[in-house]
Interface confidence: medium
């Protein structure tokens, strides 16, 4: 029996459902009574879901997995994972045994988009050209860790004096805080771009300093 899975990782958004595709080619006369199907975590070998002895043995993984029972006899051994969590990320092995066996691994990549960044300035009043200011760009509830880029009004990258911290919350999602320290010019626009490397999603925030008042 030959097992086939998609070569590319399956990308799933947090809280949505994902399908880990796996298929095999049943021989003529194949019946489900012959099938042993195991989905397991590749690294730890933890059982996720199984079908054996002619019946679905159910989910062994937080009761969020399901097979496609009507499609099994056609060789569709795909696994549905419901309400995806960050902790679900990783490699899953689809293991099919009829009389001989084969297995293949599929990767699940979890992602969550970052929120539109909020910008804060310190100090935020009595600003003069030549003053040192701290601009903070904050974006929330994304996954995986973000890439953060700063640019000035002319689109020139600002790389010096940038400190970025990323903290995971209890769901494993990241809150990003990036701090830029700059000396003010006469006028200036400072923009921050928070990129989700998996979703290729860019979230933009900017602050323009034109004397007073400030615009965000």
């Amino acid at each position: 029996v030959e097992v086939q899975v998609s070569e590319d990782p399956v990308v799933a958004l947090v809280d949505t459902d994902a399908t880990l595709r796996c298929s095999f080619s049943p021989e003529p006369g194949f019946s489900l009574a012959q099938l042993n199907l195991i989905w397991q975590l590749t690294d730890t070998k933890q059982l996720v879901h199984s079908f054996t002895e002619g019946r679905d043995q159910g989910s062994a993984y937080s009761n969020r997995t399901a097979l496609f029972p009507d499609l099994l006899v056609q060789g569709n051994a795909s696994l549905r994972l419901q309400r995806v969590r960050v902790t679900d990320e990783g490699s899953y092995t689809c293991f099919v045994s009829i009389q001989d066996f084969d297995s293949a691994a599929v990767s699940l990549q979890v992602a969550a988009p970052y929120s539109k960044p909020s910008m804060t300035l310190e100090p935020n009043k009595d600003l003069r050209p030549g003053n040192m200011v701290t601009i903070t760009c904050s974006s929330y509830q994304g996954y995986p860790e973000a890439e953060v880029f700063w640019k000035d009004g002319q689109g020139v990258p600002l790389t010096g004096n940038v400190t970025t911290s990323q903290m995971a919350n209890e769901r494993g999602l990241f809150d990003v805080h990036s701090v830029l320290r700059v000396v003010l010019g006469a006028n200036g626009t400072y923009s921050c771009l928070v990129r989700n490397p998996v979703l290729q999603q860019d979230a933009h925030g900017s602050v323009t300093i034109t004397g007073q008042p400030l615009t965000f």
């Epitope: 021989e27 042993n36 195991i38 397991q40 070998k45 059982l47 199984s50 054996t52 002895e53 043995q57 293991f95 045994s97 009389q99 001989d100 066996f101």
Partner: antibody
């Protein structure tokens, strides 16, 4: 390379039980099947049953149904075969066997060294 | 259970001989048949699986053929190391069965 190491030879009285262990190393113990095959002196091979450790499910040959129990301890990568109500005809070498990581649950690339169980009063 | 019948039960041959061992199944087993070699005091060794597939590391003088109910193990040129007992095993069903064995001895 999978290695299967069985417990030592035993002499048992008729009517008693015996439990043979088989410790696996060098492969993926939990995912694949461990079978037990016995061979009476000068006789052929006889399949007794198997266990799939990750599922905790055992299948038995009809002949041994009700008299044999196969279990596995995933934490120690050890399979066990317990045979009850022993009689003299159960005197045999008992092998554990495994298809390894790249073959089958139903053919056996790897075998234990065998455990001789002698049933005698 | 599926019954497996091997013939002959004993076979006398000389080094260099071509040897055939037959295995019959009581019902069709497609190609789900394996062959093993066993030497005295040792565990069996897998030679052939799925009727005709040579197990890694097994010399090419061993070959398997057949499908359905009738199968043959052939040793094209018997070597001194090949004197042993050979068993067939079906795995068409969850319940596995072995043939009675064929002892290949020196003529």
């Amino acid at each position: 390379q999978v290695q299967l190491v069985e417990s030592g030879a035993e002499v048992k009285k008729p009517g008693s039980s015996v439990k043979v262990s088989c410790k696996a190393s060098g492969g993926t113990f939990s995912s694949y099947a461990i079978s037990w095959v016995r061979q009476a002196p000068g006789q052929g091979l006889e399949w007794m049953g198997r266990i799939i450790p990750i599922l905790g499910i055992a299948n038995y040959a009809q002949k041994f149904q009700g008299r044999v129990t196969i279990t596995a301890d995933k934490s120690t990568s050890t399979a066990y075969m317990e045979l009850s109500s022993l009689r003299s005809e159960d005197t045999a070498v008992y092998y554990c066997a495994n298809g390894g990581d790249s073959s089958s649950w139903y053919t056996f690339d790897y075998w234990g060294q065998g455990t001789l169980i002698t049933v005698s009063s | 259970d599926i019954q497996m019948t091997q013939s002959p039960s004993t076979l006398s041959a000389s080094v260099g001989d071509r040897v055939n061992i037959t295995c019959r199944a009581s019902q069709t087993i497609n190609s789900w048949l394996a062959w093993y070699q066993q030497k005295p005091g040792k565990a069996p060794k897998l030679l052939i699986y799925k009727a005709s597939y040579l197990q890694t590391g097994v010399p090419s003088r061993f070959s398997g053929s057949g499908a359905g109910t009738e199968f043959t193990l052939t040793i094209s040129s018997l070597q001194p190391d090949d004197f042993a007992t050979y068993y067939c095993q079906q795995y068409n069903s969850y319940s596995l069965t072995f043939g009675g064995g064929t002892k290949v001895e020196i003529k």
